[in-house]
């Protein structure tokens, strides 16, 4: 291809790509009509004055994954048509003032994964058409007031994975067009009131993995268009009653991995689009009446790995759409017979790893569509007669790791289990704990010296789409029959390319190997 440097490949579509460790300077001559230039994985350490002078038609320039640590202020001179500039994954510590001067068409500027220590208002003052600014993965400790004041058209700003300890309430005030703001993985301890007031078009706000302890009551009151709010893995201990009241568009809210002790009734103000709510790994001790009553469309509610010991009978009022409820690994000893009565569409419930001693006979009375019930690792000695009889779709029931008392009172349950053996799965079966002479024997085949009629094992409905189960054998919920191991906190695995905390522990659902749904 005419005019293509030997170290590069050039396509007829005016695209030039230069890669390889042997490249130590910007190759020349570059084709005069190049519209896209990529310089990747080279040993270039600096950009001198005007290396791109003869390719003024350039629209996209990617200089990524190099050894680049120094740029001359005039490096990008004559690139007035440039719309996309990426300097990501280099070793830049300092940006020269005026570096982006003359880039009047620039819309996307990617400076992520460098070693930038600071930014100044003068850095971006010429970038009035900028729509996207990526600064994540640097060493920024603070953002000075005015840094973004000229970026009135900005729609996406990523400041994640820096070392920010505080944010000025004025720093975002002119970003009225901003749709995405990411501040995840910093060291923020609080967000001043008014910080987000100017962000009337904000759709996504990522604050996860900071050290935020308190949220101001009106922090999100101007963000009526917010759709995704990430607050997980902070130190939030309480939620002001009105904090989520003005978020009618919200469809994703993560609060797991905080220090929440209680949830006040109606705390989740009308959110007609919220379909999943993840509250696992907090310190919630009780659930009052109507705490979720505004979440009429909620389909999945995860409350596992808290310290819940009491659930008010009306706690789940309003959750008429709920399909999956996870309450495993809490401190529940008793449940009111009406607690699940409003959950007419519930399909999966996980109650394992609690301290349940008994269940009311009507506990599942109105939940006719239940397909999966997890009750393993509790303190159950028996279950009321007919507790599961009306659950025609039930195809997965886990009862192991309970101290079943195998006296004559167990016969109705034993007979039902015999009839419904396939529903129990094949991995682990319930065994007797008492009396001592039958301890360890299978509850299903135990001889209680009473004749048991011969049974026909019916065909069980096929497995439902059940909640998550661990797909490796190393999680506590897959342990053997004798195990009563408490679940530990998840091992966090934070990745570079994602903005959301990822955990490598599948046990927030805590389902067993057999639960493949």
């Amino acid at each position: 291809y005419h005019g293509c440097p030997s170290e590069c490949t050039c396509s007829r579509a005016s695209q030039v790509e230069c890669t390889g460790a042997r490249i130590v300077a910007v190759p020349t001559p570059l084709p005069w009509n190049a519209m896209s230039l990529q310089i990747l994985n080279t040993h270039i350490t600096e950009l001198n004055e005007s290396p791109f002078l003869n390719i003024s038609a350039l629209i996209a320039l990617r200089i990524e994954k190099n050894e680049l640590s120094r740029i001359t202020p005039g490096a990008f001179r004559n690139l007035g048509s440039l719309r996309y500039l990426s300097l990501a994954n280099n070793k830049l510590q300092v940006l020269p003032i005026g570096l982006f001067q003359g880039l009047d068409s620039l819309e996307s500027l990617l400076l992520s994964s460098n070693q930038l220590l600071q930014i100044q208002p003068a850095h971006f003052s010429q970038c009035s058409n900028l729509k996207e600014l990526q600064l994540h993965g640097n060493h920024l400790e603070y953002i000075p007031d005015g840094a973004f004041d000229h970026l009135v058209g900005l729609t996406k700003l990523n400041l994640g994975k820096n070392s920010l300890t505080h944010i000025s309430p004025r720093v975002f005030q002119h970003l009225g067009n901003l749709q995405v703001l990411r501040l995840y993985e910093n060291r923020l301890t609080d967000i001043p009131m008014g910080t987000f007031d100017g962000l009337v078009n904000l759709q996504e706000l990522a604050l996860q993995q900071n050290q935020i302890g308190l949220l101001s009551p009106g922090l999100f009151h101007n963000n009526h268009n917010l759709q995704r709010l990430y607050l997980s893995n902070n130190h939030i201990s309480q939620l002001p009653p009105s904090v989520f009241m003005q978020l009618p568009q919200l469809n994703r809210l993560t609060l797991f991995g905080n220090s929440l002790k209680e949830l006040s009734p109606g705390i989740f103000g009308p959110m007609p689009n919220l379909r999943e709510l993840w509250l696992y790994d907090n310190h919630i001790s009780s659930l009052p009446d109507n705490v979720f009553s505004n979440l009429r469309q909620l389909q999945v509610l995860i409350l596992s790995r808290n310290q819940i010991s009491f659930i008010s009978p009306g706690a789940f009022n309003g959750l008429t759409e709920l399909r999956e409820l996870s309450l495993h690994t809490n401190a529940l000893q008793d449940l009111d017979g009406n607690v699940f009565r409003m959950l007419a569409n519930l399909q999966n419930i996980s109650l394992q790893n609690n301290r349940l001693r008994q269940l009311p006979g009507n506990i599942f009375a109105n939940v006719n569509g239940l397909m999966a019930i997890q009750l393993q690792n509790n303190q159950l000695e028996n279950l009321p007669l007919g507790i599961f009889d009306h659950l025609g779709k039930l195809c997965e029931l886990r009862l192991y790791d309970n101290p079943w008392r195998c006296d004559s009172d167990i016969l109705p349950l034993r007979n039902w289990l015999l009839l419904n053996q396939p529903r129990l799965g094949t991995d682990t079966v319930p065994v007797c704990f008492s009396p001592a002479n039958v301890r360890g024997q299978s509850l299903i085949i135990i001889n209680v010296n009473v004749a048991v009629p011969s049974v026909h094992v019916p065909e069980v409905p096929s497995y439902p789409e059940t909640p998550w189960y661990p797909d490796t054998p190393s999680y506590p919920d897959t342990t053997s029959v004798s195990s009563t191991t408490e679940l530990t906190s998840p091992v966090e695995d934070y990745t570079d390319l994602t903005t959301i905390q990822v955990t490598d522990d599948r046990s927030v659902w805590g389902m067993t190997q057999a639960q493949s749904g």
Partner: antibody
Framework: EVQLVQSGAEVKKPGSSVKVSCKAS????????IHWVKQAPGQGLEWIGL????????NYNQKFKGKATLTVDTSTTTAYMEMSSLRSEDTAVYYC????????????WGQGTTVTVSS | DIVLTQSPDSLAVSLGERATINCRHS??????????MHWYQQKPGQPPKLLIK???SLESGVPDRFSGSGSGTDFTLTISSLQAEDVAVYYC????????FGGGTKVEIK
């Protein structure tokens, strides 16, 4: 622009395994469910299962349990489906698709990967 | 599993005319708020494309000549005025339980 780009066509011997990849871009990978769907030649669509990169959780259609294994690599924003003990009836186009919430429709699909099992 | 029966198997409609596809479920897939029922279009050599979610909600970017209706066990996809580019196979899907699809309806121009 939301994109799911799948790996190329594969021809495999009966009894072998195949691993199909699905590279996601243009959206926050860990914030969406990734489904896998099978379409045998001239046939309709069959749901295999889903994976949620957020927590690494999986759900399978019981029919494909033991046949398909779904995994993700969040560092490369890629989902994988491995099919083992291949037989001629596993010959199909396999699609990955994205869903916003667990019960939502699949709003973006990969272009499909043809797997042919033949001796 | 929930069985979805689509009818007809194929359909020939004149350009500009109405096309109606039905999908019947073996059990209800609706609550008071939602019907867990979605419609897709698939053209030869292409992946399926989402048209309608939750029975009646038009996916963004889909022409408004497509509409969905129904609840419980019976659902309908309607193309109000068939265009040449609408020639395709249409599938219904339920996400109430293990996801299943209908057998497909092939729409052609008469």
């Amino acid at each position: 622009e939301v994109q799911l780009v799948q790996s190329g066509a594969e021809v495999k011997k009966p009894g072998s395994s195949v691993k199909v990849s699905c590279k996601a871009s243009g959206f926050t990978f860990t914030d969406y469910y990734i489904h896998w769907v099978k379409q045998a030649p001239g046939q309709g669509l069959e749901w295999i299962g889903l994976v949620y990169p957020y927590i690494g959780g999986t759900n399978y259609n019981q029919k494909f349990k033991g046949k398909a294994t779904l995994t993700v690599d969040t560092s490369t924003t890629t989902a994988y489906m491995e099919m083992s003990s291949l037989r001629s009836e596993d010959t199909a186009v396999y699609y990955c698709a994205r869903g916003d919430n667990k019960y939502d429709a699949m709003d973006y699909w990969g272009q499909g990967t043809t797997v042919t099992v033949s001796s | 599993d929930i069985v979805l029966t689509q009818s007809p198997d194929s359909l020939a409609v004149s350009l500009g005319e109405r096309a109606t596809i039905n999908c019947r479920h073996s059990q209800s897939v609706s609550t008071s708020s939602y019907s867990y029922m979605h419609w897709y279009q698939q053209k030869p050599g292409q992946p399926p494309k989402l048209l309608i979610k939750y029975a009646s909600s038009l996916e963004s970017g889909v022409p408004d000549r497509f509409s969905g209706s129904g609840s419980g066990t019976d659902f309908t996809l309607t193309i109000s005025s068939l265009q040449a580019e609408d020639v395709a196979v249409y599938y219904c899907e339920q996400s109430w339980e293990i996801r299943t699809f209908g057998g497909g309806t092939k729409v052609e121009i008469k």
